[in-house]
C-alpha cells in the first residue's frame, strides 16, 4: 500500500531571465527512493539516480542545474518555460509517486512564490 505523500513548491512564478528552484519532498513512507525524474510537459529534463547521481537532458544541458538535494534549478528562464513540471519518485517497494508544480514566467518583476501544497 502506498502511504507516502509528495510536498511540492506548488504554483510558483519567476521573472524572465531569472532562475527558479523546483523542489519536491516525499514523506510518510519508509520506501527507498531509487530515482527521481523531472519532466516538463512531455520532456524528460533530468534524472537523479540514488546510486549513480545526476544526468541532465542534452536538450536542457545549458539551462538546468542539479539540486539542491533532489530538486532542480532552472536558469535563464523564458516565457516558454511557463507550464507544468513533474517530479516522479521511483521507490521500492511502493512504486511511483508524482508531484506537480506549475511555473509561470513573468515579464515583470512581480514574481512571487505561491503556497506549498500536497499531492497524495
Amino acid at each position: 500500500m502506498m502511504t507516502g505523500t509528495i510536498e511540492t513548491t506548488g504554483n510558483i512564478s519567476a521573472e524572465k531571465g531569472g532562475s527558479i528552484i523546483l523542489q519536491c519532498h516525499l514523506s510518510s513512507t519508509t520506501a527507498q527512493v531509487t530515482q527521481v525524474n523531472w519532466e516538463q510537459q512531455d520532456q524528460l529534463l533530468a534524472i537523479c539516480n540514488a546510486d549513480l547521481g545526476w544526468h541532465i537532458s542534452p536538450s536542457f544541458k545549458d539551462r538546468v542545474a542539479p539540486g539542491p538535494g533532489l530538486g532542480l534549478t532552472l536558469q535563464s528562464l523564458t516565457v516558454n518555460d511557463t507550464g507544468e513540471y513533474f517530479c516522479i519518485y521511483h521507490t521500492y517497494p511502493d512504486g511511483t509517486y508524482t508531484g506537480r508544480i506549475f511555473l509561470e514566467v513573468l515579464e515583470s518583476s512581480v514574481a512571487e512564490h505561491g503556497a506549498r501544497f500536497q499531492i497524495p
Epitope: Q41, H55, P58
Partner: antibody, heavy 119, light 107 residues
Framework: EVQLVESGGGLVQPGGSLRLSCAAS????????MYWVRQAPGKGLEWVAY????????YYPDTVKGRFTISRDNAKNSLYLQMSRLRAEDTAVYYC????????????WGRGTLVTVSS | DIQMTQSPSFLSASVGDRVTITCKAS??????VAWYQQKPGKAPKLLIY???ARHTGVPSRFSGSGSGTDFTLTISSLQPEDFATYYC?????????FGQGTKLEIK
C-alpha cells in the same frame, strides 16, 4: 518483449523522398522518447532524430535538419521518419531506438531498414 | 560537436582473454556515456549506460568505467559470442555522437 520493426526502406533517386515507419510493441509506446539512428554501409552509427514521448519536441543534427522530419502516432504505436531532398550520403540502414526509462541511452533497437539513394 | 574517439579500431583476441576498449571524448561529458555491441546484420544492443551501469540481462563480464573525457569498456573473460563491433556514445549534449567502433575479432 520489446519489439521495434522498421519498414519503408528502398531505392530512391537523389532529390527524392521516402517515409520510414517503426512499429513498436511489448511496451507502452507513449511513455517513451524515441530516436532514429543510421548506419552507412560498412560505417559507424550516426544519430538522425529524436522525438519526445508526446511528440512535442524534436531534435536533429545539422546533416539532416530541414530535410528530415520525425513524428509519431501514439494511438498506432508507430514512429515515422519523413525524408526529403535525399542525397547519396543518406544511403544507410535506418534504425529506430527507444530511450531508456533509466537514462538518456538507447536501450532497445529495431533490426533496421535499408535506404539506398542512387540514380 | 563532441567527438568520441575509440581505440583500438581493430582488436584480435582469444576466448578467455581480458579485453579493454577505450573511448575519449573531445570535451567533458560527465558520465553520459553508453556502450553498444553490434553483430553483423543485427541491431546494436545496449551494454552499459551511465558510463558504468550494466543494462538488464548483460553478463557481469562486461564492465564500464570512466568520467569526464576518458572511458573504458572491459570484458573480463572473452566468450565466443562476444566477437562483435563495440561503439561508445555520448548523450551529454546534442548532437548525440558515437565513436567510430572497435571490431573485436578472433585471434
Amino acid at each position: 518483449e520489446v519489439q521495434l520493426v522498421e519498414s519503408g526502406g528502398g531505392l530512391v533517386q537523389p532529390g527524392g523522398s521516402l517515409r520510414l515507419s517503426c512499429a513498436a510493441s511489448g511496451f507502452t509506446f507513449s511513455d517513451y522518447h524515441m530516436y532514429w539512428v543510421r548506419q552507412a554501409p560498412g560505417k559507424g552509427l550516426e544519430w538522425v532524430a529524436y522525438i519526445s514521448k508526446g511528440g512535442i519536441s524534436t531534435y536533429y543534427p545539422d546533416t539532416v535538419k530541414g530535410r528530415f522530419t520525425i513524428s509519431r502516432d501514439n494511438a498506432k504505436n508507430s514512429l515515422y521518419l519523413q525524408m526529403s531532398r535525399l542525397r547519396a550520403e543518406d544511403t544507410a540502414v535506418y534504425y529506430c531506438a527507444r530511450q531508456s526509462s533509466y537514462d538518456f541511452a538507447m536501450d532497445y533497437w529495431g533490426r533496421g531498414t535499408l535506404v539506398t539513394v542512387s540514380s | 560537436d563532441i567527438q568520441m574517439t575509440q581505440s583500438p579500431s581493430f582488436l584480435s583476441a582469444s576466448v578467455g582473454d581480458r579485453v579493454t576498449i577505450t573511448c575519449k571524448a573531445s570535451q567533458d561529458v560527465g558520465t553520459s556515456v553508453a556502450w553498444y555491441q553490434q553483430k553483423p546484420g543485427k541491431a546494436p544492443k545496449l551494454l552499459i549506460y551511465w558510463a558504468s551501469a550494466r543494462h538488464t540481462g548483460v553478463p557481469s563480464r562486461f564492465s564500464g568505467s570512466g568520467s569526464g573525457t576518458d572511458f573504458t569498456l572491459t570484458i573480463s573473460s572473452l566468450q565466443p559470442e562476444d566477437f562483435a563491433t563495440y561503439y561508445c556514445q555520448q548523450y551529454s549534449s546534442y548532437p548525440l555522437t558515437f565513436g567510430q567502433g572497435t571490431k573485436l575479432e578472433i585471434k
